[in-house]
């Protein structure tokens, strides 16, 4: 049996070498001479010759300093043979443990660690974590037990201890209030990692902490008073530019200005933000009226796109806006005037007066009236008074100029300001009907076939309006009833049916037809009838001599 005590060897041993470790023995040495040898890593395999054994005594020796961080344990096999070379023992595994010395200092995983924290962060806010490693034994010793400390902080303002580091974890957190990006945007910490829980070997690294922006500074007007002027009636006109400064990070929501007009209930003004320089551009949202108000004193507040992070006073500015008077066109009241008038209204008589009001109440101005559009040339106007009268007969049935019984004329009013301004009014003449149109037949030219003629429907048309229209009365005159008959086609008597009484010769005929409306206005119309050489429904006939009173006239 083997006698091998546990074997450990400290790393980094000083000489002289070789140095005895343990003496190994086999019980078989009582029976005769035993010779010892070793094999394995560190003996006969790389690194070869680190361990040797005295062949006759069994003393195991180390020949050079060991490095635990390179090889922490060596596995060897001991062999015992008799003088004739025969094995007297089975090979035995020998474990050599290299015990640790604190020969490695901690190493930070980075030379520079970068972190960030919001300005105004409260104590206890985590910022970042630094990490160091140590190659020494962290299981059986504290040679790799790292403790972290902060050695320095730059700047040391507003306090020299703005941050703390957890000695065990390396987590850096805020420990003092007062982080302010606008004053101190970055901090540089020199951090130390020391083994043996802070009492051993040490190394340093840098932690750079960026203080990020929050909206802790308000935009401030500079100056706080402004003057501007704007012509009346013009929308989207720039009045003035408002200037603000904001200490927060440029081109961020905490810097970008939002302008609010505090006393603009009518929504007459608007302030937009220039995205480049944060200026407020004050413009008119709608046209202003000099005659209503000549000056506005606006109070404008400025905030940011995002809310303030802390309680801040909102900056305000006062803007005095002078409205400039502009010569405005006269305004017809109403802008569209409706007047009812009979179509037989007497020529030269006054229909109505249509006048305009002068908006420029602060100017003494004279208004002159003219007719701008009068397509039928029916009207004339008094240039001073705006009185409108007829210069020709009106006609409701003039369908070229009258639509839906309405005649439209445009009137203009011109002041004597500088420059001259002109306003327009619309005059609608609603023409009431007079029974000035007798009924007429439609069509007036009719075709029949000689054989088996088909009766023809004739519509009765009256340009007037009820009650000056249907029911109509129809009557054949001048002997036409000898050859022709008529009868009403519908209860309103708005059409009749014409047909011959007997077979007629091919040729042209004239029929006198008297038509009378509901108010007894009548008119005799001559119908031109052609009888064709055909049967049933007629086509178009050759032209023949007309026949008076429905009788054929020989050629």
């Amino acid at each position: 049996d083997w006698v091998i005590p546990p074997i450990s060897c400290p790393e980094n041993e000083k000489g002289p070498f070789p140095k005895n470790l343990v003496q190994i023995k086999s019980n078989k040495d009582k029976e005769g001479k035993v010779f010892y040898s070793i094999t394995g890593q560190g003996a006969d395999t790389p690194p070869v010759g680190v361990f040797i054994i005295e062949r006759e005594t069994g003393w195991l020796k180390v020949t050079e300093p060991l490095d635990r961080e390179r090889i922490a344990t060596y596995t060897l096999f001991s062999h015992a043979v008799s003088s004739n070379g025969n094995a007297v023992e089975d090979p035995m595994e020998i474990l050599i443990t290299v015990t640790d010395q604190n020969d490695n200092k901690p190493e930070f995983t980075q030379e520079v660690f970068k972190g960030s924290v919001m300005e105004g962060a409260l104590p206890g806010t985590s910022v970042m974590e630094v990490t160091a490693t140590d190659a020494d034994d962290d299981v059986n010793t504290y040679n790799a037990a790292i403790a972290y400390t902060i050695l320095s902080q730059d700047p040391e303002l507003p306090d020299k201890n703005m941050f703390t580091i957890n000695r065990n974890t390396g987590v850096i957190s805020v420990v003092t209030t007062g982080l302010d990006r606008e004053s101190f945007p970055t901090y540089t910490l020199v951090v130390q990692a020391a083994d043996l829980q802070g009492e051993g070997l040490s190394t340093t690294a840098t932690a750079v902490i960026t203080v990020t922006d929050t909206n802790d500074n308000p935009p401030i007007f500079n100056p706080t008073t402004y003057k501007g002027q704007v012509p009346e009636n013009e929308a989207n006109v720039v009045i003035t530019t408002l200037k603000v400064t904001d200490a927060d990070a440029p081109n961020t929501p905490a810097w970008e200005a939002v302008y609010t007009i505090l006393n603009d209930d009518g929504g007459q003004f608007v302030v937009t933000t220039n995205p480049v320089n944060n200026d407020g551009i004050l413009k008119t949202a709608k046209g202003l009226d000099f005659e209503a108000k000549q000056q506005y004193i606006l109070h404008v507040a400025v905030t940011n796109v995002v809310p303030f992070e802390v309680s801040l006073t909102t900056s305000t500015a006062t803007v005095t806006v002078d409205v400039l008077d502009v010569n405005e066109a006269p305004i017809f009241v109403p802008p569209e005037k409706r007047v009812e008038v009979s179509e037989d209204f007497g020529v030269g008589q006054e229909i109505t007066s249509y006048t305009a009001q002068e908006p420029d109440t602060f100017m003494e101005q004279k208004i002159t009236y003219r007719i701008w559009r009068d397509t039928a040339n029916w009207l004339e106007i008094n240039p001073d008074t705006g009185a409108i009268s007829t210069r020709a007969e009106l006609d409701r049935e003039d369908f070229e100029h009258v639509k839906n019984s309405t005649y439209t004329a445009l009137i203009i009013a011109t002041d004597n300001g500088s420059p001259v301004a002109t306003g327009t009014g619309t005059l609608l003449l609603i023409l009431s009907d007079v029974n000035d149109n007798a009924p007429i037949p439609e069509p007036r030219t009719i075709f029949f076939c000689e054989r088996n003629p088909k009766p023809q429907v004739i519509n009765i048309i009256d340009a007037d309006l009820p009650p000056n229209t249907s029911p109509f009365t129809a009557e054949l005159t001048h002997g036409a009833s000898a050859n022709w008959t008529i009868q009403y086609n519908d209860p309103t008597q708005e059409s009749i049916i014409l047909k011959p009484k007997m077979a007629l010769e091919v040729g042209d005929y004239k029929i006198n037809l008297k038509l009378m409306d509901n108010q007894n206005k009548d008119q005799v119309t001559t119908l031109e009838v052609s009888v064709c050489d055909c049967e049933g429904a007629a086509g178009v006939c050759r032209k023949a001599q007309p026949v008076e009173a429905g009788l054929q006239i020989p050629a």
Epitope: G124, S126, E129, T131, T133, D138, Y142, A144, A145, I146, A147, T149, T164, I165, N166, R167, N168, T169, G170, V171, S173, V175, A194, Q197, G198, E199
Partner: antibody, heavy 120, light 112 residues
């Protein structure tokens, strides 16, 4: 609200093994060092083990070194204690505790504990 | 390892009395960073322990000002100026300066 909930306790035979878990919520688990502390019946509090945020440094009490292993899973917000070769003197209420961010003191929040009994 | 010894084991008091608990470490517990990580914890029956004092003399948030801590090097004291019923329980000192970290054996504060 910070919460630490231990589980995995129970009756174990001497020489046996057990794995305790501690589910953390209400804080950024990965930024905090964590401890296991125990209290045996009729005796005082005993600190058992500690682990840093990234498991880079681990400390054990001499009484458990080589038998207990502390570990953590930051993705699952969970702390573990693997106990092997258990002895009757390991019978105790086991608490999971949180080290504060600053490390100014050892433990600011404690769980309600999980009971481990080692007996045949 | 640092051994923490607490005295007395039991401290009978009347409500309103002052109480004083001593804790002695087997070696200095001043950390290499200059801080002394000596803490006091209270465990009430049926509850998890809670922190009272850290770094020798700093009261944890929410701890009444009748609790105070003092000491340096190896000798530390916890004082309760006027004991109230809610203060009863077992008090432990703890050192977090040198791993492995250690608790004291505990002092039971009870009514006479």
């Amino acid at each position: 609200d910070v919460q630490l909930v231990e589980s995995g306790g129970g009756l174990v035979q001497p020489g046996g093994s057990r794995k305790l878990s501690c589910a953390a919520s209400g804080f950024t688990f990965s930024s905090y060092g964590m401890h296991w502390v125990r209290q045996a019946p009729e005796t005082g509090l005993e600190w058992v083990a500690y682990i840093t945020t990234r498991s880079s440094t681990i400390y054990y009490a001499a009484t458990v070194k080589g038998r207990f292993t502390i570990s953590r899973d930051n993705a699952r917000n969970t702390l573990f204690l693997q106990m092997t070769s258990l002895r009757s003197e390991d019978t105790a209420m086991y608490y999971c505790t949180r080290e504060p961010l600053t490390g100014y003191y050892a433990m600011d929040y404690w769980g309600q504990g999980t009971s481990v009994t080692v007996s045949s | 390892d640092v051994l923490m010894t607490q005295t007395p084991l039991s401290l009978p008091v009347s409500l309103g009395d002052q109480a004083s608990i001593s804790c002695r470490s087997s070696q200095s517990i001043v950390h290499s960073d200059g801080n002394t990580y000596l803490e006091w914890y209270l465990r009430k029956p049926g509850q998890s322990p809670r922190l009272l004092i850290y770094k020798v003399s700093n009261r944890f948030s929410g701890v009444p000002d009748r609790f105070s801590g003092s000491g340096s090097g190896t000798d530390f004291t916890l004082k309760i100026s006027r004991v109230e019923a809610e203060d009863l329980g077992v008090y432990y000192c703890f050192q977090g300066s040198h791993a492995p970290w250690t608790f004291g054996g505990g002092t039971k504060l009870e009514i006479k």
